[in-house]
Interface confidence: low
């Protein structure tokens, strides 16, 4: 299960960037190069590095020393370098109680963002800064340290007394001067004289605490073991040059035998423990791309079957000052169009073998919310909207307006703040919604800013399925179906009855259903029905019928 | 812009068989694409229409039963099949794509991209 950290106050601060490097790449160093900036059609940049094995030392600037997530080296190597107090020391009691550890949780994290393209440098003469991770504790890097500005070159290390012992050449005696420097930095020089010359060491001793570093041809898909030692060794059946073991397939092991005129017998047997091919591995963008506004999750994949044991294998990655022992990380609550940058590095059996550098910038964020200014109707047919954009990026406007179950939606240009809605019914309520959206990834859609307003009135449309029927020889019955639109607040049905150019009769009545009675005996009568919607009459219905004699 | 480039077109007896494609291409966020056809002296009429999100169809009472609209996300494409053509389904035929969102896909007006159409004549 990947970790999920939120980081809650998420500001941009100076990432630090790193020198590039070339193949292949010793298992120790920890200098990352640069991965290039973020490219949309990519999704994400990648650089995985490797760096030759005469370029293994690690620099360490100012910045990096003054950010109180840099991690302190607490491994003991072959060659002692002091260790640099950082900030972070005088934070930290002891050696032995150091809590700067690899973990999946980052409750306290915070996640800057790089700030911008200038944060990751790939030009040559750039500072440049190493990794900030912990070197391992059972293999440790060894490296050249640059000393920031704020340290002392004659501070010691806090968490060791390291003893330089230097032989002085004497004809009859081995007298040997020791500087011990402790934990206050005070130089303590002592002169001791012994009689008998010491007797040489083991090999099996001198070399038991070797460190190997592995380094990989992508070509001939091999290894070198790049044995970490001050002088030139021996090996047994000659399997090394230049304390280098070479063509080391992948998974295997290897017993490589090692002696030097400095120690005797037994001489150091190494068993050499072959991590799997670099290529065998990819750093994979897992993102979700509806959550990639504010979501990073990046996963090594296994691309290639190998032989090597899976359990041997460890993974960690670092984003910020957010460190993760997993194969998968998750990061959330990320700010939107940020440039992130996530170093990892894959170990085996505690050796680093490969390691890979991802600038992430995350998506498009939904837009804010637009501003309405005001939205009306000053006609029957039409009705106007302006509003301000939202202040985040955004590619278009959509516009939707409803009429009780109908619904229709525009996309407007980015670049429009009004928009005049045509034919509209009239006396009608139109609910507007408009939000903005981008098309990023997915399709993001900003909050809608919500108005509404009624159309003004307009004439009433035709009554319709009129009829006249005689009830009696001098009574007509009048009846008519409502209009289709009534277009107006009120509903009256109104009635008149011409005889000639005479009107005879006006009625008017909530219903379209008129009884005119007492009309003249065969006389030829106009009837004419229209509603009137308390605005406008509509057009009338016209219809002609004729009174019969009288039948008494 | 959505640039559509209607297919497929073309002579064919009464009681015959088409399928027209419309193909879609540049910024191809479209909600429905649509079929209208104008037959000579008429008004620009409704078809059939096809909402890309659900699935839905939405066709004239003239060609129910007779014509079926579907779409393929993977090509962008469009496709009206036309069965038991008569004479009177003689037309030019239009495609259309309309970027909003509707209850009503049948309305013209509506529809802010349209192709160059494709002529399809039905003898009897």
């Known amino acids: 299960q990947s970790p999920t950290p939120s980081p809650t106050g998420l500001t941009t601060a100076k990432m630090p960037s790193v020198p590039l490097s070339s193949d292949p790449l010793p298992t120790h160093t920890t200098a990352f190069s640069p991965a290039s900036t973020f490219e949309r059609e990519n999704d994400f940049s990648e650089t995985t590095t490797s760096l030759s094995p005469d370029n293994t030392s690690t620099q360490v600037s100012p910045d990096s020393l003054d950010n109180a997530s840099a991690f302190n080296t607490t491994g003991v190597s072959s060659v002692q370098t002091p260790h640099l107090p950082t900030h972070a020391d005088s934070q930290t009691p002891s050696a032995g109680t150091d809590t700067q550890t690899f973990s999946g949780s980052a409750a306290n994290a915070k996640l800057n963002p790089t700030p911008g393209s200038n944060a990751i440098s790939d030009v040559p003469g750039e500072r440049s800064t190493a990794s900030t991770f912990p070197t391992d504790p059972v293999s440790p890097l060894t490296t050249t340290l640059s000393l920031a500005h704020h340290s002392s070159a004659a501070l010691p290390a806090r968490t060791s007394n390291t003893t330089i012992t230097a032989n002085t050449s004497d004809a009859y005696l081995n007298a040997s001067e020791t500087t011990t420097l402790s934990p206050s930095g005070s130089a303590v020089i002592s002169t001791t004289t012994i009689a008998t010359t010491p007797s040489k060491p083991t090999c099996d001793e001198k070399y038991a605490n070797i460190t190997v570093d592995y380094l990989y041809n992508k070509e001939t898909k091999l290894f070198t073991a790049k044995l970490n030692v001050n002088e030139n060794v021996e090996c047994g059946n000659n399997t090394c040059t230049n304390n280098e073991v070479h063509n080391l397939t992948e998974c295997k092991n290897a017993s490589v035998s090692i002696s030097h005129n400095s120690c005797t017998a037994p001489d150091k047997t190494l068993i050499l423990d072959v991590p799997p091919g670099v290529e065998k591995f990819q750093l994979h963008d897992c993102t979700q791309v509806e959550k990639a506004d504010t979501t990073i999750c990046l996963k090594w994949k296994n691309i290639e079957t190998f032989t090597c044991d899976t359990q041997n294998i460890t993974y960690r990655f670092q984003c910020g000052n957010m460190i993760f022992d997993n194969k998968e990380i998750k990061l959330e609550n990320l700010e939107p169009e940020h440039e992130y940058k996530c170093d990892s590095e894959i170990l085996y059996n505690n050796h680093k073998f490969t390691n890979a550098s991802k600038i992430i910038k995350t998506d498009f964020g939904s837009p804010g919310e637009p501003q309405i200014i005001f939205c009306r109707s000053e006609a029957a047919h039409q009705g106007v909207i302006t509003w301000n954009p939202p202040q985040r990026s955004f590619h278009n406007f959509t516009l939707c307006y409803i009429k009780e179950t109908e619904k229709d939606c525009l996309n407007l240009d980015k670049n429009l703040i009004k928009y005049d809605l045509q034919n509209l019914k009239p006396y009608t309520k139109y609910v507007l919604s408009l939000h903005a959206y981008i098309i990023a990834k997915v399709q993001r859609n900003g909050s809608a800013a919500m108005c509404h307003f009624t159309t003004k009135s307009a004439p009433p449309s035709q009554v319709w399925n009129m009829t006249v029927s005689m009830t009696s020889d001098n009574s007509m019955h009048v009846k008519c179906r409502p209009p289709r639109d009534r277009n107006g607040p009120h509903e009256r049905y109104h009635l008149e009855v011409e005889a000639g150019n005479t009107l005879v009769r006006n009625e008017s009545h909530k219903n379209c259903d008129f009884r005119v009675k007492d009309l003249q005996y065969s006389t030829d009568y106009t009837f004419k029905a229209y509603f009137h919607n308390g605005d406008y009459p509509g057009e009338p219905f016209i219809l002609h019928h004729s009174t019969s004699y009288n039948s008494k | 812009e959505v640039q559509l480039l209607e297919s497929g077109g073309g002579l064919v007896q009464a009681g015959g068989s088409l399928r027209l494609s419309c193909a879609a291409s540049?910024?191809?966020?479209?909600?429905?694409t649509g079929w209208f056809r104008q037959a000579p002296g008429k008004e620009r009429e409704f078809v059939a229409s096809?909402?890309?999100?659900?699935?839905?169809?939405y066709y004239a009472d003239s060609v129910k039963g007779r014509f079926t609209i579907s779409g393929d996300n993977a090509k962008n494409t469009v496709y009206l099949q036309m069965n038991s053509l008569k004479p009177e389904d003689t037309a030019i035929y239009y495609c259309?794509?309309?970027?909003?969102?509707?209850?009503?896909?049948?309305?013209?007006?509506?529809?802010?991209?349209w192709g160059q159409g494709t002529q399809v004549t039905v003898s009897s």
């Open positions: 096809i909402r890309w999100s659900g699935g839905n169809t």
């Open positions: 259309a794509a309309l970027r909003s969102w509707t209850t009503t896909p049948q309305r013209e007006v509506l529809y802010d991209n």
């Open positions: 540049g910024r191809t966020l479209t909600f429905y």
